[in-house]
């Protein structure tokens, strides 16, 4: 089955400059498949944009402004690149790639799409990291005492732009697990966003990582924030005991600052 | 040129009660296109649903129903049990591809249609409340409430910035909250939840205990051990750079 | 001080031409999408026409359309808006206006028009 | 295209009152595309709100606007003898035409 995978989830432009967009293929051999882009508008349909067929040749949907888009496709790495120029305001949109697959059952056909990049068009470079800034929240002893069970918080600061994908897994898994989060929150010039996972008591003994995608992530790739294994047996100690708390004798936690 | 018109931009659904979503064609007719439903969900992830000709995407068949009323020049789909999974914006989509002659393997989409979802009517079921620290980071965790309107408090004289909560359907149909805060003293923060004219304390919830042990290390790995079994345990983090924060459990 | 001055109006009989022209000053001009925008005597704003920064997307109102050509010359911080085929509709003013561009989001996505043109009368009468 | 219709065409008011202005579209939009605007005789309209909710620069607070979809509102909390005007409202929706509503007059009573 073909698979699509945007691996920029968004790409921030100054007016002016060239966006290069990038859809990766699997599953299906590049050069034997035609891709297509679209693009969404905030507030508009999704429309067809442009395509690349199997043997190379490109269709530009009419209407769509000649030499704004440029498409093409490498083999050698299954990828098709879609190239805006000279990006203004009216491109701002999320591009998604797309192709027909043919399903198992009598040659029937359907069009699955990639998982979309948001073009953003900002007035400024930003210097400063931008980054997601993570601060971890392990299960409160209350939570893990009287329900059979915990909650991990991952509070991500202080990134730009605002599109971000968090999700969970365990330590030496690869499935997903189901999470929940608030909304992306503007704070002065950055953004602000918190997921949280609820696990059984017996998971709270694995290690959990909170995976983070962001475009501004350090070498572009996924930040992964390891959350350390609970344990649930809690000991009563007496308060005059050396493990009692005080300005020096925090639980230190070491977090990530990806800043150059 | 043809024009795909959803019946309604929002549908509320409740979970477990069958909904429909219809989309008219204005221009054409229905019968000489394909249609198709995508599901958009909050990652911008489209997710193919149905294509005429009884298609489904993986997991779509046994929860989704397709169908073409051709008198009417519209496409139905209905979603027979709503889960909070279902949540979306759902896109009807037309193409000819395979129908011979002049044909277009392009797809052709109307707009939107926001599917929201709501638990279904229940028993009022009143919150737990507990309360996580990270230096000056608070976070107040409200779990399984119903019905949905709550307001949440958290207690400080020190307050340096709070955020709006976020209230979310959990997976058993009810709801779930999370409220966070900065403050000078985190530590003395205390969250109070008022729900269905009730109040409720995170302390009414607190274990009685001295223990600051909560977290398990591994034996080898990232440990210092000052005394007994109190253990300082470092949470790692695949990236270069590294700054430490206090943990407060 | 950010301001857009209007020239090219006047008397022009149906059937005849006029060319309109909006200097912009104080601000990166190449930045900014540019409107036209009409009032007919005792009326309404109509939206007339609309160009973006670097000139890729051009859009008309269905009543100009094929006879309005709107055009920019960002190096002379330039708005243009071509009127042939004239009719007695078509007498208004005609304000050329700029559209929003970077607000306090740093993110260009918002849309009105935030600064005018003083406005010029087009009359077009036999 | 999308119509845009404003109520009510007329709205006569003493300074100091509260003046709601009600725009309503033919069918939905983002609430980025919508902006509303002030003119006064011989003079060029000014730009009051964009996004349908944020003050555009200089303006002052007793002027808000909210909604989403297809209703829109302008509220002027307190009515200054300066406030008494046209008001437009206009949506950038999905395509061309750009278009405005008809206009609400706002006079003194």
């Known amino acids: 089955a073909g698979h699509l995978e945007q691996p920029q989830i968004s790409s921030t432009k100054t007016l002016s400059k060239t966006a290069r967009l990038e859809c990766v293929v699997s599953g299906i051999t590049i050069s034997a498949t035609s891709v297509y882009w679209y693009r969404e508008r905030p507030g508009e349909v999704i429309q067809f944009l442009v395509s690349i067929s199997y043997d190379g040749t490109v269709r530009k949907e009419s209407g769509i402004p000649s030499g704004k888009f440029e498409v093409d496709r490498i083999p050698e790495t299954s990828t098709s690149t879609l190239t805006i120029h000279n990006v203004e305001k009216q491109d701002i949109a999320t591009y998604y790639c797309a192709l027909w697959e043919a399903q198992q059952e009598l040659g029937k056909k359907i069009k699955v799409f990639g998982p979309g990049t948001k073009l953003i068009i900002t007035d400024k470079q930003l210097d400063a990291d931008v980054s997601p800034k993570p601060t971890i929240f392990l299960p409160s002893i209350a939570e893990t005492k009287l329900q059979k069970a915990g909650t991990y918080l991952c509070l991500l600061e202080k990134f730009f732009p605002d599109v971000i994908k968090i999700h969970w897994q365990e330590k030496k898994s690869n499935t997903i697990l189901g999470s929940q989060e608030g909304n992306t929150m503007k704070t002065n010039d950055t953004y602000m966003k918190f997921s949280w996972l609820t696990v059984p008591e017996k998971s709270l003994d694995k290690e959990h990582r909170c995976i983070v995608r962001h475009e501004n992530n350090k070498n572009g790739v996924d930040q992964e924030i390891i959350f350390p294994p609970i344990k649930t047996d809690v000991i009563t100690m007496d308060p005059k005991d050396n493990c009692s708390k005080d300005a020096n004798d925090t639980l230190l936690l070491q977090l990530t600052n990806t800043s150059a | 040129a043809i024009e795909l018109v959803p019946e309604h931009q929002t549908v509320p659904v409740s979970i477990g009660v069958p909904a429909t979503l219809r989309c008219s064609m204005k221009g054409e007719a229905i019968g000489n296109y394909y249609i198709n439903w995508y599901r958009k969900t909050q990652g911008n992830t489209m997710t193919f649903i149905y294509r005429e000709k009884d298609i489904y995407g993986p997991g779509f068949k046994d929860n989704f129903q397709g169908d073409i009323d051709i008198a009417k020049n519209l496409a139905v789909l209905k979603i027979l049990a709503p889960s909070e999974r279902d949540e979306g914006s759902y896109y009807c989509a037309c193409d000819t591809l395979g129908m011979g002659g002049e044909y277009t393997d392009k797809l052709i989409f109307g707009k939107g249609t926001r599917v929201t979802v709501e638990p279904r009517s229940q028993p009022h079921t009143k919150p737990s409340v507990f309360v996580m620290k990270n230096g000056t980071n608070v976070a107040c965790l409200v779990k399984e409430f119903y019905p949905k309107d709550i307001r949440i408090n958290l207690v400080s004289s020190k307050k340096i910035t709070e955020f709006d909560p976020a209230i979310v359907i959990s997976p058993s149909g009810k709801y779930n909250a999370v409220k966070l805060g900065k403050y000078e003293d985190s530590n003395s923060v205390t969250c109070s939840v008022q729900h269905d004219n009730k109040t409720v304390h995170s302390t009414d919830f607190e274990v009685k205990t001295d223990s600051t042990d909560h977290v398990k290390p591994k034996e080898t790995e990232n440990t210092k051990q000052p005394s007994k079994s109190c253990h300082k345990p470092k949470a790692i983090v695949h990236t270069e750079k590294v700054n430490m924060m206090s943990l407060t459990v | 001080e950010v301001q857009l001055v209007q020239s090219g109006g006047g008397l022009v009989k149906p059937g005849g031409s006029l060319r309109l022209s909006c200097a912009a000053s104080?601000?990166?001009?190449?930045?900014?999408?540019m409107n036209w925008v009409r009032q007919a005597p005792g009326k309404g704003l109509e939206w007339v026409s609309s160009i973006s920064s670097s000139s890729s997307y051009i859009y008309y109102a269905d009543s100009v359309k094929g006879r309005f050509t709107i055009s920019r010359d960002n190096a002379r911080n330039s708005l243009f808006l071509q009127m042939s085929s004239l009719r007695a509709e078509d007498t208004a003013v005609y304000y050329c206006a700029r559209e929003i561009g970077v607000t306090g989001t740093t993110y260009y996505q918002d849309y009105g028009m935030d600064v005018w043109g003083q406005g010029t009368t087009v009359t077009v009468s036999s | 295209e999308i119509v845009m219709t404003q109520s009510p065409g007329t709205l006569s008011l003493s300074p100091g009152e509260r003046a709601t202005l009600s725009c309503r579209a033919s069918q939905s939009f983002s609430s980025n595309y919508l902006a509303w605007y002030q003119q006064k005789p011989g003079q060029a309209p000014r730009l009051l709100i964009y996004?349908?909710?944020s003050r555009a620069t200089g303006i002052p607070d007793r002027f808000s606007g909210s909604g989403s979809g297809t209703d829109f509102t302008l509220t002027i909390s307190r009515l200054e003898p300066e406030d008494f005007a046209l008001y437009y409202c206009q949506q950038y929706g999905s395509s061309p035409p750009f278009t405005f509503g008809q206009g609400t007059k706002v006079e003194i009573k």
């Open positions: 996004g349908a909710s």
């Open positions: 104080g601000f990166t001009f190449s930045n900014y999408d």
